[in-house]
Interface confidence: medium
Amino acid sequence: MGVPTALEAGSWRWGSLLFALFLAASLGPVAAFKVATPYSLYVCPEGQNVTLTCRLLGPVDKGHDVTFYKTWYRSSRGEVQTCSERRPIRNLTFQDLHLHHGGHQAANTSHDLAQRHGLESASDHHGNFSITMRNLTLLDSGLYCCLVVEIRHHHSEHRVHGAMELQVQTGKDAPSNCVVYPSSSQDSENITAAALATGACIVGILCLPLILLLVYKQRQAASNRRAQELVRMDSNIQGIENPGFEASPPAQGIPEAKVRHPLSYVAQRQPSESGRHLLSEPSTPLSPPGPGDVFFPSLDPVPDSPNFEVI
């Protein structure tokens, strides 16, 4: 009677859940930028030049106090985590090759040191950043890693990296130009996922007012129905124990029923199974990462298809 029906209670629960999901979709990906490697394998002849590329994906904070540190280094595959070991590229450390700039800004290594070693790292407005190696030799073969660190107020917030293989070949088996092999489908799926996450973020923000309006209308309709039922049952209300009402302390010995206002009822329903720990549980997507959390474990792309492009 005065109690919300199962359908009404359910609709509120679904409303809460939808709200939570859209909130998560809207807030979740904000910090979730990642690095994609369009190509996982580069096969080049000796003496050729090659440009290794990484791409910064997902939402990028363009705040005035945010900058990105991007760099390159060599590593090896025989470890637990790819790219954890840092070796210099042609005697230049990752510090020597780093770029530092805001969001999707263009930048490049202007110092002579890198250019004297036949290297140049660069970054464009679209999140692509690269290292160009001139006059390749067999010694340049190996695993190359790009690293991106988001910095806010002088401190690193998030870091991600990508890996790719360079094979420099000589002799009759060597290609005449560099041949690049696209990253595995798993990588493509991750790129699509990042794009979808960004899309979901935008859709979530746009749809949020609509969902709130629908939930509000639903609550309003339910409260109107309850008000009508309360008017009808006003004559025989006393003495009925009902979860929809709270018994007040009797005034001058006369028992009285106090009707819960729909809004206060909503507030009391709020800590439901679906939404209770949304903002407080450490494992939820809305929580900041712990000190040791890794945002995106690095992908270790292995070319699993014969697809390739000549560049």
Partner: antibody
């Protein structure tokens, strides 16, 4: 050996300007963030400004914001502090300090210069 | 702004004895990336400051192992296991977690 040598201090009238320089040697200057820290006579240390290795981002406390500008010239291995609209309370020894940079995570002013004295007085 | 409060302000110590300096921040200095950028500096008489400890408990290279740092959140401590004559000077704690970066007011360590 890491060396930081400040210069440019002196006596200036209130409202005047001064430009401090810090010459760095013994390390790859462009790979490090840099800071200016000051110490008023008989007082404690106060952070004044900092700049990241690339030079594109700078930070200041409210006490100097809008009056002081930190900059660097990586080609010359030099750090600068342009001080305008100077006040009596800016009188201090100004130190330049190197900030350790770990992948863009700046912390620990690991090497300091000997300081240069700025006196603002009429 | 985060205020760093040190105690005591003056610390007379007998050589060979231990010493302890406390530093309290007005709010947590745990950065959003999980690190706590709490540093300790020593300024010897007539000299520039020098780094002793970074990130709460990491000794800078060349700093004797009699110096140690500890603490978390808002309460931090610098300990000297056995004070030596060369340890005299003013000790400053410093937080670099939140801009503006701030120093404590300093603790003067002197030999009895």
């Amino acid at each position: 050996e890491v060396q930081l040598v400040e210069s440019g201090g002196g006596l200036v009238q209130p409202g005047g300007s001064l430009r401090l320089s810090c010459a760095a040697s013994g390390f790859t200057f462009r790979n490090y963030g840099m800071s200016w820290v000051r110490q008023a006579p008989g007082k404690g240390l106060e952070w004044v400004a900092s700049i990241i290795s690339g030079g594109s981002y700078t930070y200041y406390p409210d006490s100097v914001k809008g009056r002081f500008t930190i900059s660097r010239d990586n080609a010359k291995n030099s750090l600068y502090l342009q001080m305008n609209s100077l006040r009596a309370e800016d009188t201090a020894v100004y130190y330049c300090a190197r900030i350790y940079d770990h992948d863009g995570d700046y912390y620990a002013m690991d090497y300091w210069g000997q300081g240069t004295t700025v006196t603002v007085s009429s | 702004d985060i205020v760093m409060t040190q105690s005591p302000l003056s610390l007379p110590v007998t050589p060979g004895e231990p010493a302890s300096i406390s530093c309290r921040s007005s709010q947590s200095i745990v950065h959003s990336n999980g690190n706590t950028y709490l540093e300790w500096y020593l300024q010897k008489p007539g000299q520039s400051p020098q780094l002793l400890i970074y990130k709460v408990s990491n000794r800078f290279s060349g700093v004797p192992d009699r110096f140690s740092g500890s603490g978390s959140g808002t309460d931090f401590t610098l300990k000297i296991s056995r004070v030596e004559a060369e340890d005299v000077g003013v000790y400053y704690c410093f937080q670099g977690s939140h801009v503006p970066w701030t120093f404590g007011q300093g603790t003067k360590l002197e030999i009895k």
